[in-house]
Interface confidence: low
């Protein structure tokens, strides 16, 4: 009696169970009563990542350098290529079809989290007691200089963009 279901890694065709092709190979011809399933390896630029009965392999993803992408992991006959962004760039969207430059934190803001290939720089305002006088994608807010520890006094108050200015103590008291 012909089978109605097949074992794992098999498929039903013409009332019989045929072996699926292993990852990295595509189907050339179904099995028959007398012959096994015929499979062929995917070509260099293609892959199949599951046990399958596909007659065509899938093309590897193209990491388009025009859009700031580079190959993070080269595809094999069983895996797709993984793209990432070039140094200094991060993915513009979840699907990562293009990359854009990391944002710099303006003076008065410091880097809370440095950008990665998939996320942009996160900036935060410098709180009281801290400052940033540069536009940077790496620099955190820096603490104001402590004049007291240098035996000096504050001559000019600091802001979120400028350090305090220290000066000598007034000796005429």
């Amino acid at each position: 009696e012909p089978p109605t279901a097949c074992r794992e890694k098999q498929y039903l065709i013409n009332s019989q169970c045929c072996s699926l092709c292993q990852p990295g190979q595509k189907l050339v011809s179904d099995c028959t009563e007398f012959t096994e399933t015929e499979c062929l390896p995917c070509s260099e630029s293609e892959f199949l990542d599951t046990w399958n009965r596909e007659t065509r392999c899938h093309q590897h993803k193209y990491c388009d350098p025009n859009l700031g992408l580079r190959v993070q992991q080269k595809g094999t006959s069983e895996t797709d290529t993984i793209c990432t962004c070039e140094e200094g760039l991060h993915c513009m969207s979840e699907s990562c079809e293009s990359c854009v430059p990391h944002r710099s934190c303006l003076p008065g803001f410091g880097v809370k989290q440095i950008a990665t290939g998939v996320s942009d720089t996160i900036c935060e305002p410098c709180p009281v007691g801290f400052f940033s006088n540069v536009s940077s994608a790496f620099e955190k807010c820096r603490p104001w200089t402590s004049c007291e520890t240098k035996d000096l006094v504050v001559q000019q108050a600091g802001t979120n963009k400028t350090d305090v200015v220290c000066g000598p103590q007034d000796r005429q008291r």
Epitope: R56, C57, H58, Q59, K61, Y62, D64, P65, N66, L67, G68, M92, S93, S95, E97, S98, V100
Partner: antibody, heavy 120, light 107 residues
Framework: QVQLVQSGAEVKKPGASVKVSCKAS????????VNWVRQAPGQRLEWMGL????????SYNQKFKGRVTLTIDKSASTAYMELSSLRSEDTAVYYC?????????????WGQGTLVTVSS | EIVMTQSPATLSVSPGERATLSCKAS??????VAWYQQKPGQAPRLLIY???DRRTGIPARFSGSGSGTEFTLTISSLQSEDFAVYYC?????????FGQGTKVEIK
């Protein structure tokens, strides 16, 4: 909303070259990619290539085997497509289409099209 | 190159009816498919991108579905302004390729 305005219709002889311009209404083109697509009479749309104004990078449809050159003038927010060694089968409407950089191939905004007629 | 095949070539539908357009890719293009509408003498207009995302300003009667090699554009209730030619585009790999188009005409 980006608006793209293309140069006017052209009539060319076989073997000549044509250069079509595409001016964007945005101040800076660099948040967009610019694709060029053509459509011969009664035919499907055909992608010719793409230029990324951010870094000047280009990708071409190999069908055109070096006959197409895409360039950009960022200061004028204008993209150009030059097609050389024209033949009668190049008679078509040529479109520029730009896409936001987040989805660079979607071809969100289109020019009105430029008819190029190649005839001896 | 990846070949995109659309069916049917022509679809005759009455206003208010549902229209279902098919697009098949010759190999896996994941969800990297866009749909365009083109009227005579006009440039194409983007309707759907990434297989199912509707472009801002496109009416909700337009919807896209599918992944891999089979994609569908559905117009739930055809309006008079929807009679046009519809093209699918794959942007999984270069060269980007369009289908040959489906003409939606008044029955």
């Amino acid at each position: 909303q980006v608006q793209l305005v293309q140069s006017g219709a052209e009539v060319k002889k076989p073997g000549a070259s044509v250069k079509v311009s595409c001016k964007a209404s945005v101040y800076s083109f660099t948040g967009y990619t610019v694709n060029w697509v053509r459509q011969a009479p009664g035919q499907r749309l055909e992608w010719m290539g793409l230029i990324n104004p951010y870094n000047g990078g280009t990708s071409y449809n190999q069908k055109f085997k070096g006959r197409v050159t895409l360039t950009i003038d960022k200061s004028a927010s204008t993209a150009y497509m030059e097609l050389s060694s024209l033949r009668s089968e190049d008679t078509a409407v040529y479109y520029c289409a730009s896409s936001p950089y987040s989805n660079p191939y979607a071809m969100d905004y289109w020019g009105q099209g430029t008819l190029v007629t190649v005839s001896s | 190159e990846i070949v995109m095949t659309q069916s049917p070539a022509t679809l005759s539908v009455s206003p208010g009816e549902r229209a279902t357009l098919s697009c098949k890719a010759s190999q896996n293009v994941h969800t990297r498919v866009a749909w365009y509408q083109q009227k005579p003498g006009q440039a194409p207009r983007l309707l759907i991108y990434l297989a199912s995302d509707r472009r801002t300003g496109i009416p909700a009667r337009f919807s896209g579905s599918g992944s891999g090699t089979e994609f569908t554009l559905t117009i739930s209730s055809l309006q008079s302004e929807d009679f046009a030619v519809y093209y699918c585009l794959q942007h999984w790999t270069y060269p980007l390729t369009f289908g040959q188009g489906t003409k939606v005409e008044i029955k």
